[in-house]
């Protein structure tokens, strides 16, 4: 039978009471019921109490008494009592409500927005409510729009309702702006502000925040979350369509997040319990705002049981290159539910082996690939709860770009020099995966560029590939290759033997494999000068003679050759340039700069230095020669000649040692006749000794020597006696 409406203790549709009083309101009904209260009352915990009791004849009725102590203006609103668990179609018949005004002379408006206006969204042509409801129905309220408009209720388009505020039946652009409700109570003006924003129909984005496609095991619960993002002024309707929609399988929850200052986020969450095969298919979330529409869908797959299939993505043997920032080793996996993934390297857990190994989904990422990363990689896949396990192994080869060992260990800032005509052994040791091949090339120096680096100036010139029979450049004795173990690695050593070093240039060894190519330039500069830099003094000059110095440098290693004089002044060495230097002479392998100072005096003594700049390092190199000009001194004999006797046919030596500056010239006389060198008479070094072989009677006589230089001369004489007779026939 039809239930009689619940009955409230206060009769009529509305009731006015003063703020600060206590509100007592009883609801009596034929079934259990609940209260629906204004928002601010529901939040009250201490002021509000609800007491339930049995009442009426025989206690057969249900009573509920609501008590609100010290009621306040913002408690104004609808208080309703309704039966529990009544079909929604009969809702109207099973609810009783009353609107209670809680009057406060100091607070005419229920909601006061005296400083910052409350934003109201409006759509042109639709109803717009300016919700400045009041705490007493007798309060007169005026609606104003900044700057000067007053919106007057006409009972049609604009209606005043003390329970709601101003109702504008079809809003226009004229209502967009800053609106103020004003009320004067006891001579005091009260204002509450509202700002209308035009409602838009923009949908920024719609997403289903679950992986696509969605996979589920039969009997499990499906939860799909649809999110719509809109500007602040947009409201949306969200609906779902799905395979078993006719049976209303899904429950949908909605909520809105307005915490973001730039956008509204609307959520619609679809849930289906105990998924069956009939629930698989396309699930679509549709979002509408006025004429705007957006939708997003996802496929839902249902599986009867857990499974794993795994295959190689490409081939079983994979290749990468050492030095790569990142390499992804991945397998083609189909599985449900998601299996646990463990990667092994050579049988051991990869991620424990190195921090450079990271698991991402079904892939193993190797960061900063090195040669040591080569090996066998196994993916272990397991769905433990279903006892499903699979594994698959792939082999990774890490290729290495060739490296030339000598290039790494070489610390020479500038090239080595190779003595002219020498035999030289040049070696390049290369490492790489796969094993690199080594080829030799010859790059001749351009001899026109006498003052430039060979490896700079010859860019445009061709390089020639070499073999043992090549006739380019220097004669090659052999080119050989052998394997060498260096630092525990198998390296390829290639040796080029130059038989006869004659031509300057650059030998280039190139090591190549499929990863790349690397080259080493060996500057092969021939030198005809020891160490590539040599200073020569013809002889130490005496006062009045010429000083002759020469400086020879390797032309590929040095430039800017000049002679300077070093003088020490106040403990500081000063460099003085020497004027009137001759032009340098450039030859095939070297540059020579001669310095001649004519007719030297004692003041020309000092440290002479040849200065040249190293082409490679830019460093200035000095080679010094200490020159001491000697004062002239008349000759003097260290020992006078003395008479002596010699046997016929024997030999004899006469010594005439003299000193003087410059070194004296020695002249020999016999019986006042100048002696010339002839068979049997030999003049020793500097003519200071006279050697007579097989003495004869004719050799007897007076011998004298004369030592002469620019300062004078000195003489000494002696008589040579020959003893015994000669056998003339023998001499014939």
């Amino acid at each position: 039978s039809k239930l009689k409406d619940p009955e409230l203790s206060l009769k009529g549709t509305q009731h006015i009471m003063q703020a600060g009083q206590t509100l007592h309101l009883q609801c009596r009904g034929e079934a259990a019921h609940k209260w629906s209260l204004p928002e601010m009352v529901s939040k009250e915990s201490e002021r509000l109490s609800i007491t339930k009791s049995a009442c009426g004849r025989n206690g057969k009725q249900f009573c509920s008494t609501l008590t609100l102590n010290t009621a306040q203006a913002n408690h104004t609103g609808f208080y309703s009592c309704k039966y529990l668990a009544v079909p929604t179609s009969k809702k109207k018949e099973t609810e009783s409500a009353i609107y209670i005004f809680i009057s406060d002379t100091g607070r005419p408006f229920v909601e006061m927005y005296s400083e910052i206006p409350e934003i109201i969204h409006m759509t042109e042509g639709r109803e717009l409510v300016i919700p400045c409801r009041v705490t007493s129905p007798n309060i007169t309220v005026t609606l104003k729009k900044f700057p000067l408009d007053t919106l007057i209720p006409d009972g049609k388009r604009i209606i005043w309702d003390s329970r709601k505020g101003f109702i504008i039946s079809n809003a226009t652009y004229k209502e967009i702006g800053l609106l103020t409700c004003e009320a004067t109570v006891n001579g005091h003006l009260y204002k509450t502000n509202y700002l209308t924003h035009r409602q838009t129909n923009t949908i920024i984005d719609v997403q289903i925040s679950t992986p696509r496609p969605v996979k589920l095991l039969r009997g499990h619960t499906l939860v799909l979350n649809c999110t719509a993002t809109t500007p602040l002024n947009t409201r949306v309707q969200m609906t779902w369509s799905y395979p078993d929609e006719k049976n209303k399988r899904a429950s949908v929850r909605r909520r809105i997040d307005q915490s973001n200052s730039h956008a509204n986020i609307f959520y619609s969450v679809l849930t289906i319990d105990k998924m069956q095969n009939k629930d698989k298919g396309l699930y679509t979330c549709r979002v509408r705002s006025g004429p705007s529409f957006k939708s997003v869908n996802t496929s839902v797959h249902i599986y009867d049981k857990a499974f794993i299939t795994v295959k190689h993505r490409k081939q079983q043997v994979l290749e990468t290159v050492a030095g790569k920032r990142s390499y992804r080793l991945s397998m083609k996996v189909k599985a449900f539910p998601s299996p646990e993934v463990v990667w092994l390297k050579d049988g051991l857990p990869a991620t424990e082996k190195s921090a450079r190994y990271l698991t991402r989904g079904y892939s193993l990422i190797i960061k900063d690939v090195t040669e040591e990363d080569a090996g066998n990689y196994t993916i272990l896949l397991s769905i433990k709860q279903s006892n499903v396990f699979k594994n698959l192994t792939a082999t990774l080869i890490v290729n290495v770009k060739p490296q030339i060992y000598e290039k790494a260990v070489s610390s020479f800032p500038d090239p080595a020099l190779y003595p002219l005509g020498s035999r030289q052994i040049l070696t390049c040791t290369a490492y790489g995966i796969p094993q690199p091949t080594i080829k030799w090339f010859w790059h001749p120096c351009n001899h026109n560029h006498s003052e430039a680096r060979c490896d700079f100036c010859s860019n445009n010139e061709e390089s020639f590939i070499l073999d043992a029979d090549s006739n380019m450049g220097n004669r090659i004795e052999s080119i050989t290759q052998r394997m060498a173990i260096i630092e525990g690695k198998n390296k390829m050593a290639s040796t080029l033997v130059v038989a006869d070093s004659r031509i300057s240039g650059i030998y280039i060894c190139i090591a190549s494999n499929k990863v790349g190519t690397v080259g080493r330039n060996i500057s092969f500069y021939i030198t005809d000068v020891p160490n590539g830099f040599h200073v020569n003094l013809e002889k130490m000059p005496t006062e009045g003679e010429d000083l002759k110095l020469s400086c020879t440098v390797n032309k590929f290693l040095y430039r800017d050759v000049t002679w300077i004089l070093l003088r020490t002044v106040n403990n500081r060495t000063m460099h003085y340039s020497i004027s009137k230097q001759k032009m340098a002479i450039t030859k095939e392998h070297s540059i020579t700069l001669n310095l001649t100072i004519m007719n030297v005096s004692l003041q020309d003594s000092g440290t002479y230095a040849c200065r040249a700049r190293n082409v490679y390092t830019g460093e200035e190199i000095l080679q010094k020669k200490e020159i001491t000009i000697r004062d002239q001194e008349a000759p003097y004999l260290l020992r006078n000649l003395s008479d002596h006797t010699v046997a016929i046919s024997s030999s004899t030596t006469l010594d005439c040692h003299a000193n003087g500056v410059p070194e004296p010239q020695i002249t020999w006389f016999k019986n006042n006749h100048k002696i010339q060198q002839e068979p049997g008479i030999i003049l020793g070094p500097g003519s200071s000794t006279l050697f007579i072989e097989r003495v004869t009677e004719e050799d007897e006589g007076v011998y004298h020597c004369k030592a002469t230089n620019q300062k004078g001369s000195v003489e000494s004489s002696a008589y040579l006696t020959v003893q015994g007779t000669s056998d003339k026939s023998n001499l014939e």
Epitope: F146, L178, N193
Partner: nanobody, 119 residues
Amino acid sequence: EVQLVESGGGLVQPGGSLRLSCAASGFTFSSYAMSWVRQAPGKELEWVSGINSGGDRTVNADSVKGRFTVSRDNAKNTLYLQMNSLKPEDTALYYCAKSIPPTDDRNYWGQGTQVTVSS
């Protein structure tokens, strides 16, 4: 004597930015909500932005939402309006005024600063 002095207006290209300032004196600035109001040539006054006395709550008219930001520095008695992504229709004389909505007493309004948005 109450004084509100606006500054910072000028000529700017569409898409550009300007920052208006309003220096207040002669009343307890920190006790009042403040407004920015504008008047385009030949049009009526339009309320643009407002900020509460503490400076922690702001609100903008629909026409400038997301582009203009109102702020205040109570220690300096100054109100600001940061205007970004300016459009030709933002061309107007901009006033700062006491309260929301602005008081009818024009003594509590500034003299205005001109903003022109044009290429």
